[in-house]
Interface confidence: medium
């Protein structure tokens, strides 16, 4: 229940990639505005996105304070132009979000192959250690900083002339693989957190192939 000219938000959804975290909801407002609050299970509520007509709110600044905490958000509905007005219970209508634990649930962004270098029959493939929006001591932490050994990468590689893929895994950001001399190879990587139950894998990186700009070829 509530005032006749406000409706409660619904379909509250967390959208999060590499800790960039936005709460989305419906409906598009008609004669109403929204305010979002966020809290940890044991903490105080903090208000964000005051009296907005948007149906999303960037909560990154809050969740990066401790990505291992579990957060809950709620969206309040107010009549446009009369934000002091409340529902029949003496407070504005609101709806709770699902719980969200960034460390366990943020999507892994698409990785990028930084470089590859061939030395004889070995190729070293390096994955870019992507920076997140988690910040400590004037340092934007990388995915590796945040996830440490929980994060692995899977490399898919194949001869340019065939479609048969091989795989390799690393718990660093580098692979060292054996290749056939004189053959060109293509590479794609995927970030993986094996211990997760949801959002375990990223999308595959763009494919990079030997004989193109990014790599370096040294025959020894």
């Amino acid at each position: 229940s509530g005032t006749t000219n406000t409706v409660a938000a619904y379909n509250l959804t967390w959208k999060s990639t590499n800790f960039k975290t936005i709460l989305e909801w419906e409906p598009k407002p008609v004669n109403q505005v929204y305010t979002v609050q966020i809290s940890t299970k044991s903490g105080d509520w903090k208000s964000k996105c005051f009296y907005t007509t948007d149906t999303e709110c960037d909560l990154t600044d809050e969740i990066v304070k401790d990505v291992k905490q579990t957060y809950l958000a709620r969206v309040f509905s107010y009549p446009a132009g009369n934000v002091e007005s409340t529902g029949s219970a003496g407070e504005p209508l609101y709806e709770n979000s699902p719980e969200f634990t960034p460390y366990l649930e943020t999507n892994l962004g698409q990785p990028t192959i930084q470089s590859f270098e061939q030395v004889g029959t070995k190729v070293n493939v390096t994955v870019e250690d992507e920076r997140t929006l988690v910040r400590r001591n004037n340092t934007f932490l990388s995915l590796r900083d945040v996830f440490g050994k929980d994060l692995i990468y899977t490399l898919y590689y194949w001869k340019s002339s065939s479609s048969g893929k091989k795989t390799a895994k690393t718990n660093t950001n580098e692979f060292l693989i054996d290749v056939d001399k004189g053959e060109n190879y293509c590479f794609s990587v995927q970030a993986v957190i094996p211990s997760r139950t949801v959002n375990r894998k990223s999308t595959d990186s763009p494919v990079e192939c030997m004989g193109q700009e990014k790599g370096e070829f040294r025959e020894i």
């Epitope: 990505v67 250690d129 920076r131 400590r136 340092t139």
Partner: antibody, heavy 121, light 106 residues
Framework: EVKLVESGGGLVQPGGSLRLSCATS????????MSWVRQPPGKALEWLGF??????????EYSASVKGRFTISRDNSQNILYLQMNTLRTEDSATYYC????????????WGQGTTLTVSS | DIQMTQSPSSLSASLGGEVTITCKAS??????IAWYQHKPGKGPRLLIH???TLQPGIPSRFSGSGSGRDYSFSVSNLEPEDIATYYC????????FGAGTKLELK
């Protein structure tokens, strides 16, 4: 297995200089922030400084107590962390530890066994 | 640099009892405080980060609270293995350890 092994401690006269080393193995050195922490005899731990990882350009930060006298550097080809100490004082006498630093929760997750510096005339 | 004033410097307690340690920062540290346990001959072990978040594998007998400049750390139902020196560490602006609290058995 992650290993950190400090070396280079000893007896130095006040005003002297010394360089400590920390040889590391068992992890990709360039991906981690590295730090120095000391503990004078019978006293508390004291953070001295850290050097950031490759993703953050290997930049350094220092505590006020050693800034301008101590310099942290790293040899990423040899996986060695250094602490260059100049204009040493008697109050710099301590056991010096290198530690791997996980910045997100301020965790020193691996420590060396320490090397002892005595500054005395 | 931010200063951390930790108290008491030592305390004694009985097995099964509870102890509380406090740390006061020289300025607001935005809840960026961690608590470490240090035993002789070992590297310090992180117990709690961001004021109250327990590290994986740390029993819930350990807890932390606080905000602004004032923070506290408690151990309940004391066990023999809890005998150690405990340090607070602020990580809001660089890093600063407190002076440590030596916990002994009565």
């Amino acid at each position: 297995e992650v290993k950190l092994v400090e070396s280079g401690g000893g007896l130095v006269q006040p005003g002297g200089s010394l360089r400590l080393s920390c040889a590391t193995s068992g992890f990709t050195f360039t991906e981690y922030h590295m730090s120095w922490v000391r503990q004078p005899p019978g006293k508390a731990l004291e953070w001295l400084g850290f050097i950031r990882n490759r993703a953050n350009g290997y930049t350094t930060e220092y505590s006020a107590s050693v800034k301008g006298r101590f310099t942290i550097s790293r040899d990423n080809s040899q996986n060695i962390l250094y602490l260059q100490m100049n204009t040493l004082r008697t109050e710099d006498s301590a056991t010096y530890y290198c530690a791997r630093l996980t910045m997100v929760v301020a965790e020193f997750d691996y420590w060396g066994q320490g090397t002892t510096l005595t500054v005395s005339s | 640099d931010i200063q951390m004033t930790q108290s008491p410097s030592s305390l004694s307690a009985s097995l099964g009892g509870e102890v509380t340690i406090t740390c006061k920062a020289s300025q607001d540290i935005n809840k960026y405080i961690a608590w470490y346990q240090h035993k002789p001959g070992k590297g310090p072990r992180l117990l709690i980060h961001y004021t109250s978040t327990l590290q994986p594998g740390i029993p819930s007998r350990f807890s932390g609270s606080g905000s602004g400049r004032d923070y506290s750390f408690s151990v309940s139902n004391l066990e023999p293995e809890d005998i150690a020196t405990y340090y607070c560490l602020q990580y809001d602006n660089l890093l600063t350890f407190g002076a440590g609290t030596k916990l002994e058995l009565k």
